[in-house]
């Protein structure tokens, strides 16, 4: 029969024959022969391969360097890499999460729209009319102005995006 020019899924072509790829978590030791199957070995401790492969080396698990603010979010296996995330108050600088930066704070006049996570920074939004923020914070949302009316008071000083309204007593009408 004609030697194959293409192989099935999870196979590879070598020496005019189709050999089985090694399964995830294993590396190649020796190609198959016409008499024997591909010889594979499991990846070692702290190594992985996440696809059907013909690699002769396994990949090293990622190291979550605490000096860069990183910690392990999910321990790697022979088939998956370690997933790193950042320590509390920090977030990754990239999708690969190779280093961390401190969460951004929202300045006065801005509130937190979305609190930062290990992988995303704080999202700030300007305080709309009727709301204010007088602190620099990574957690505080814009607060609504105090409603003087509900306290039976009147506005003595208008609020801004950075300050609350100041309420005061109503002027008494003299009889």
């Amino acid at each position: 029969p004609e030697p194959p020019t293409a192989c099935r899924e999870k196979q590879y072509l070598i020496n005019s024959q189709c050999c089985s790829l090694c399964q995830p978590g294993q590396k190649l030791v020796s190609d198959c022969t016409e008499f024997t199957e591909t010889e594979c070995l499991p990846c070692g401790e702290s190594e992985f391969l996440d696809t059907w492969n013909r690699e002769t080396h396994c990949h090293q698990h990622k190291y979550c360097d605490p000096n860069l603010g990183l910690r392990v979010q999910q321990k790697g296996t022979s088939e998956t890499d370690t997933i790193c995330t950042c320590e509390e108050g920090w977030h990754c600088t990239s999708e690969a999460c190779e280093s961390c930066v401190l969460h951004r704070s929202c300045s006065p006049g801005f509130g937190v729209k979305q609190i930062a996570t290990g992988v995303s920074d704080t999202i700030c939004e300007p305080c709309p009319v009727g709301f204010f923020s007088n602190v620099s914070s990574a957690f505080e949302k814009c607060h609504p102005w105090t409603s003087c009316e509900t306290k039976d008071l009147v506005v003595q000083q208008a609020g801004t995006n950075k300050t609350d309204v100041v309420c005061g007593p109503q002027d008494r009408l003299r009889a």
Epitope: L28, V29, S30, D31, T33, F35, L41, P42, T56
Partner: antibody
Framework: SVKESGGGLFKPTDTLTLTCTVS????????ISWVRQAPGKGLEWIGI??????TYYASWAKGRFTISKTSSTTVDLKMTSLTTEGTATYFC?????????WGPGTLVTVSS | QIVMTQTPASVSAAVGGTVTIKCQAS??????LAWYQQKPGQPPKLLIY???TLPSGVPSRFSGSGSGTDFTLTISGVQCDDAATYYC???????????FGGGTEVVVK
């Protein structure tokens, strides 16, 4: 196929290098094991070199034997400080624990 | 280092009979075990790998079983041509080393 060469008559304390020459497959995706057999005795595993270049040895062989790839088709077994116990037929074979292709062997005789 | 203990050292069988050879590993090796047949003046020939898989071309009268530390090679319906020495070989799953059993001489009467 695989074939060993470099055997012969050697003196104790000599250093010798055996060569395993392969054809029909690539050392970039296949491991090579070395095994020896003293006259009338059983098989004795010496060591292995993987496609990656990583090597492992039997505990008794560490420090006395060195396996290395010397070209895209050859693997050497270097033996230092030969003793008369080194008298054996030395085989190379493709693989780790699926040794289908073996060479015919090369005889090493160590005698004073 | 792993140690493979093979028994018996020698066994005789009549043509058509059955031979059983055992191999014990000093620690668990899963199914990373092979059996070889060797005749005088020849290199070993692979009979079984992964404890129970026969390479194509090896007669079906040869079979292997076992996992962990205990393994068996069985020759059913022994033929004259089966007279040889048989060796087991076990290896660490890490790839860090293997060892052969001491061998079993099979004499066919």
């Amino acid at each position: 196929s695989v074939k060993e060469s470099g055997g012969g008559l050697f003196k104790p304390t000599d250093t010798l290098t055996l060569t395993c020459t392969v054809s029909g497959f690539s050392l970039s995706s296949n491991a090579i094991s070395w095994v020896r057999q003293a006259p009338g005795k059983g098989l004795e595993w010496i060591g292995i070199i993987y496609a990656s270049g990583d090597t492992y040895y039997a505990s008794w062989a560490k420090g006395r034997f060195t396996i290395s790839k010397t070209s895209s088709t050859t693997v050497d077994l270097k033996m230092t400080s030969l003793t008369t116990e080194g008298t054996a037929t030395y085989f190379c074979a493709r693989g780790y624990t699926t040794l289908y292709f073996w060479g015919p062997g090369t005889l090493v005789t160590v005698s004073s | 280092q792993i140690v493979m203990t093979q028994t018996p050292a020698s066994v005789s069988a009549a043509v058509g009979g059955t031979v059983t050879i055992k191999c014990q590993a000093s620690e668990s090796i899963s199914t990373r075990l092979a059996w070889y047949q060797q005749k005088p003046g020849q290199p070993p020939k692979l009979l079984i790998y992964s404890a129970s898989t026969l390479p194509s071309g090896v007669p079906s009268r040869f079979s292997g079983s076992g996992s962990g530390t205990d393994f068996t090679l069985t020759i059913s319906g022994v033929q004259c041509d089966d007279a040889a020495t048989y060796y087991c070989q076990g290896g660490y799953s890490s790839g860090a080393g293997t060892a052969f059993g001491g061998g079993t001489e099979v004499v066919v009467k």
